[in-house]
């Protein structure tokens, strides 16, 4: 059965001939347990391992360090894969990151990064990125020079304030930076003028909360 194959990520799944988007089990280096993930096999050639998804506000993303570390939610809907898993996967080989966004008017956009990995827990899951392209703004809405991950109970930002408390959710805040895809979910009509919403600054501005987001990774050599 496909579950028994030692897939490291969704790229392995795709290359084994499974080209339908859905939930698959992967075996990540240095992780004791296999992990169920959503594999996007449709976007830009497929093989994408989804590490975050927002679509309907059914899941609370205002959580603490431990939950962001180990992940929460369900890969069939809204979820955060978990920083420990993201770290472990991106330590296996070189990865790229793609972020798919949709606003409440149905407009879609994406941002893509040629290199993506994060540090370990001791390094506060610091974000490392290179090579930004895409349709969600010429300028990157993720901090390119490296930012530590912060949650409501772990203040690792570069602000005298507590970004994760003010803007909600766990994220690579700077001071407090131009994005937060783990912010509060606001429905249509309520999504304007919200600093603590689901924000991607160079797509829809500083206070527009988005309708849906997907963060996904794929090996560079796919």
């Amino acid at each position: 059965r496909e579950e028994e194959k030692p897939f490291r990520d969704c790229a392995d799944v795709y290359q084994a001939g499974f080209n339908k988007s859905g939930i698959y089990t992967i075996y990540i280096n240095n992780m004791p347990e296999p992990k169920k993930v959503f594999c996007n096999m449709d976007v830009n050639g497929g093989g994408w391992t989804v590490i975050q998804h927002r679509e309907d506000g059914s899941l609370d993303f205002q959580r603490g360090w431990k939950e962001y570390k180990m992940g929460f939610g369900n890969p069939s809907g809204e979820y955060w894969l978990g920083n420990e898993f993201i770290f472990a996967i991106t330590s296996q080989r070189q990865y790229m990151l793609r972020i798919e966004l949709m606003d409440w008017e149905g407009n879609r956009a994406y941002s893509q990064y040629d290199r993506f990995h994060i540090g370990n827990e001791k390094q506060n899951y610091r974000l490392y990125l290179k090579g930004h392209t895409g349709t969600a703004g010429k300028q990157s809405s993720l901090i390119l020079h490296g930012a530590d991950f912060s949650t409501k109970d772990a203040d690792n930002d570069n602000c005298m304030c507590k970004c994760a408390l003010m803007l909600t959710g766990g994220w690579w805040f700077d001071a407090c930076g131009p994005s937060n895809l783990n912010g509060m979910f606001y429905t249509a009509g309520q999504n304007h003028g919200k600093l603590n919403g689901i924000k991607w600054h160079y797509f829809k501005g500083p206070s527009y909360s988005l309708r849906s987001t997907t963060m996904m990774i794929r090996p560079l050599d796919f």
């Epitope: 703004g137 020079h145 930076g177 600093l195 501005g205």
Partner: antibody, heavy 121, light 107 residues
Framework: QVQLVQSGAEVKKPGASVKVSCKAS????????ISWVRQAPGQGLEWMGG????????NYAQKFQGRVTITADESTSTAYMELSSLRSEDTAVYYC??????????????WGQGTMVTVSS | SYELTQPPSVSVSPGQTARITCSGD??????AYWYQQKPGQAPVLVIY???ERPSGIPERFSGSSSGTTVTLTISGVQAEDEADYYC?????????FGGGTKLTVLG
């Protein structure tokens, strides 16, 4: 419509400090980034630093680090820029300007009228 | 920190097209903004995000971007367009201005 109104002209002696104020009216103050930009006579615009009042975080250009202090008082919707150890080359018009968002990487969509600071012995 | 380079001056006759360039290594990945400043006045934003025009700015003002250079174009230049023009860009923590370009409208 938001307006930024600055304090009046100042004449200071070398070595002294100056504190210029910038009061916002007609809109939300705390969630916008307020920057300070100066312009020496006949010269170009030079960014000094700024603050996002809601986050309380000030950010300074390297050139002015240690000599400039930017603060904000949310209760009065006023931002302040204090420049110490003044020298003659600090003679300039000092503008406050608002970023259109609570983030640095943006346009200055609203400017104050400017405050002339003259440093002379 | 990086620099933005502009020509010190540009001259053009009324009705002609003026082009003011601004170059910088970060511009392929960062937006540029343009300001007009007339003597004794505060700067006014005329172009944002490389090519977008704020409301109230005449259509003759436009912006474009190619690689490390952004360009402010003023079509059908009028006498009132004579001013200093500054480009500006910013990253996550710092703001940079170009040195400014004096636009002279001849005649």
């Amino acid at each position: 419509q938001v307006q930024l109104v600055q304090s009046g002209a100042e004449v200071k002696k070398p070595g002294a400090s100056v504190k210029v104020s910038c009061k916002a009216s007609g809109g939300t103050f705390s969630s916008y980034a307020i920057s300070w930009v100066r312009q020496a006579p006949g010269q170009g615009l030079e960014w000094m630093g700024g603050i996002i009042p809601i986050f309380g975080t000030a950010n300074y250009a390297q050139k002015f680090q240690g000599r400039v202090t930017i603060t904000a008082d949310e209760s009065t919707s006023t931002a302040y820029m204090e420049l110490s150890s003044l020298r003659s080359e600090d003679t300039a018009v000092y503008y406050c300007a608002r970023f259109e968002s609570g983030y640095w990487g943006d346009a200055f969509d609203i400017w104050g009228q400017g405050t002339m600071v003259t440093v002379s012995s | 920190s990086y620099e933005l380079t502009q020509p010190p001056s540009v001259s053009v006759s009324p009705g002609q097209t003026a082009r003011i360039t601004c170059s910088g290594d970060a511009l392929p990945k960062q937006y540029a903004y343009w300001y007009q400043q007339k003597p004794g006045q505060a700067p006014v934003l005329v172009i944002y995000k490389d090519s977008e025009r704020p409301s109230g700015i005449p259509e003759r003002f436009s912006g474009s971007s190619s690689g490390t250079t952004v360009t402010l174009t003023i079509s059908g230049v009028q006498a009132e367009d004579e001013a200093d023009y500054y480009c500006q860009s910013a990253d996550s923590s710092h703001v940079v201005f170009g040195g400014g370009t004096k636009l002279t409208v001849l005649g």
